[in-house]
Amino acid sequence: ETDEEPEEPGRRGSFVEMVDNLRGKSGQGYYVEMTVGSPPQTLNILVDTGSSNFAVGAAPHPFLHRYYQRQLSSTYRDLRKGVYVPYTQGKWEGELGTDLVSIPHGPNVTVRANIAAITESDKFFINGSNWEGILGLAYAEIARPDDSLEPFFDSLVKQTHVPNLFSLQLCGAGFPLNQSEVLASVGGSMIIGGIDHSLYTGSLWYTPIRREWYYEVIIVRVEINGQDLKMDCKEYNYDKSIVDSGTTNLRLPKKVFEAAVKSIKAASSTEKFPDGFWLGEQLVCWQAGTTPWNIFPVISLYLMGEVTNQSFRITILPQQYLRPVEDVATSQDDCYKFAISQSSTGTVMGAVIMEGFYVVFDRARKRIGFAVSACHVHDEFRTAAVEGPFVTLDMEDCGYNIPQTDESTLMT
């Protein structure tokens, strides 16, 4: 179902001050400039729809150019509580507090928000990424240390008149960026409180948010170049499917990954790629300007629609799932990494997917919208697409019901 109804108050179609407010690149994340404290301290913050804590570097670290200095803020309040966030690889820990926060290229408001001041971390900050913290935009259920810690976006909506919705346009460059180019480049837009019609073409199609923790959705069918993978649709969502701007790749459950790679290999068999390419280990290169995009298939994910028995599909190109990589040793060529990888925690629709689309996180109506991004990389023959409706039966059966345990949900 497309969103052709009149827009709600506050959802005007142009948010000029927020357009182009993101920088970065898919491999190291997209970040927005934020200010924290009084007087304001400016930091670059990773936009992450796969977590729910607002956490910033608050101590010197070799990979940080700057960090939040709580002692310099007259509005900082200590919550006298620690927070520890382990991942499968790495972790961060810190101290909880609140302070005044604003987004210079966002809504003209200041909110008091919870902040995790990161004092120690391992494998969290990325050398050269140019961000100093993370803005977790998902729901309270996965906030650390527990769901009583109100996430930033909840605080923003509660304390202001900003509508309960944000949208993301992540723009992959289509070519590798060196450090100075990243600093100067446009990475996309985070529109807080609305939808900017200049950022997409065609119609927005919405899929329900299955459960408000991660931004969980249901995939009902997968096609490679129009060929159905023909798997039980539960496999596509085992153990969940989420939309996560903080992940680089399209990550697929083991069985689905193996089937998808087999199908992509078959479709692109005119060239023989090393096994290491499909593993994400080896790059493949072509002479500059000669990348044979046409030999690689398009990938379509069918998502549950808003109407019973109705779905729609989003289709990405190899320009999205082959990630350009700069390597000095092969700098005369165009080199790429395969940006689809295996997951043990379900499907993750990361930057590889999001760079093809304008994605609307309509929290107010518990749905996520997709439209073709005005900045997606394509060629003269094919373009990313959002199309529907399609008739799909028994879509509810595609969702996997995770057995309830006390285990961490963030161990990804």
Partner: antibody
């Protein structure tokens, strides 16, 4: 400039173990896999295995899976190879190398001598 | 495992000559072959990837060719600094394997 700095030569006793290091610089460490290669005089080059610094995923040559263990410390951009139960067969020069297309960058070599 | 065979262990040439070093794979590896140069006491240096592409900074007198199972590294206008051992490598499938090496001697 991409550089792989390996630890110094090791003289070790049979039956013991040794841990070699390879410190990377000049690129985003977590973006490329690190490989280890063994070279014995007159026996050419043998691929031992590799590790993905972004998530510590490893893949080994079956021949070395009980001999070598690869680990990584991203905070120092360093990869390690632990060699266990050393015998004279493990006396060799060891290299770390970085992925790209094949192995465009190599460390400067670590000589391991196993001797009683 | 894929066996990479360099049948010539030694090759002798003169400065200014053209020399071809061959490598044979035991099964089809496409063009997923690299060539390395190793001088005495040094680490291998990458010369060629994808069978025929030169790495940045490699002199254009080094040329790679071949696909499938048969590969050749050609050095035209051999220089004295080319005295080294040359190895081929397949990176088509795991485990990655290397040829036994060909030592180039300058007359």
């Amino acid at each position: 400039e991409v550089q792989l700095q390996q630890s110094g030569a090791e003289l070790v006793r049979p039956g013991t173990s040794v841990k070699l290091s390879c410190k990377a610089s000049g690129y985003t460490f977590t973006s490329y896999w690190i490989h280890w290669v063994k070279q014995r005089p007159g026996q050419g080059l043998e691929w031992i295995g590799m590790i993905d610094p972004s998530d510590s995923y490893t893949k080994y040559n079956q021949k070395f899976k009980d001999k070598a263990t690869l680990t990584v410390d991203t905070s120092s951009s360093t990869t390690y190879m632990h060699l266990s139960s050393l015998t004279s067969e493990d006396s060799a020069v060891y290299y770390c190398a970085r992925s790209g297309v094949a192995f465009p960058y190599w460390g400067q070599r670590t000589l391991v001598t196993v001797s009683a | 495992d894929i066996v990479m065979t360099q049948s010539q262990k030694f090759m002798s040439t003169s400065v200014g000559d053209r020399v071809s070093i061959t490598c044979k794979a035991s099964q089809n590896v496409g063009t997923n072959v690299a060539w390395y140069q190793q001088k005495p006491g040094q680490s291998p240096k990458a010369l060629i990837y994808s069978a025929s592409y030169r790495y940045s900074g490699v002199p254009d007198r080094f040329t790679g060719s071949g696909s499938g199972t048969d590969f050749t590294l050609t050095i035209s206008n051999v220089q004295s600094e080319d005295l080294a051992e040359y190895f081929c490598q397949q990176y088509n499938s795991y485990p990655y394997t290397f040829g036994g090496g060909t030592k180039l001697e300058i007359k």
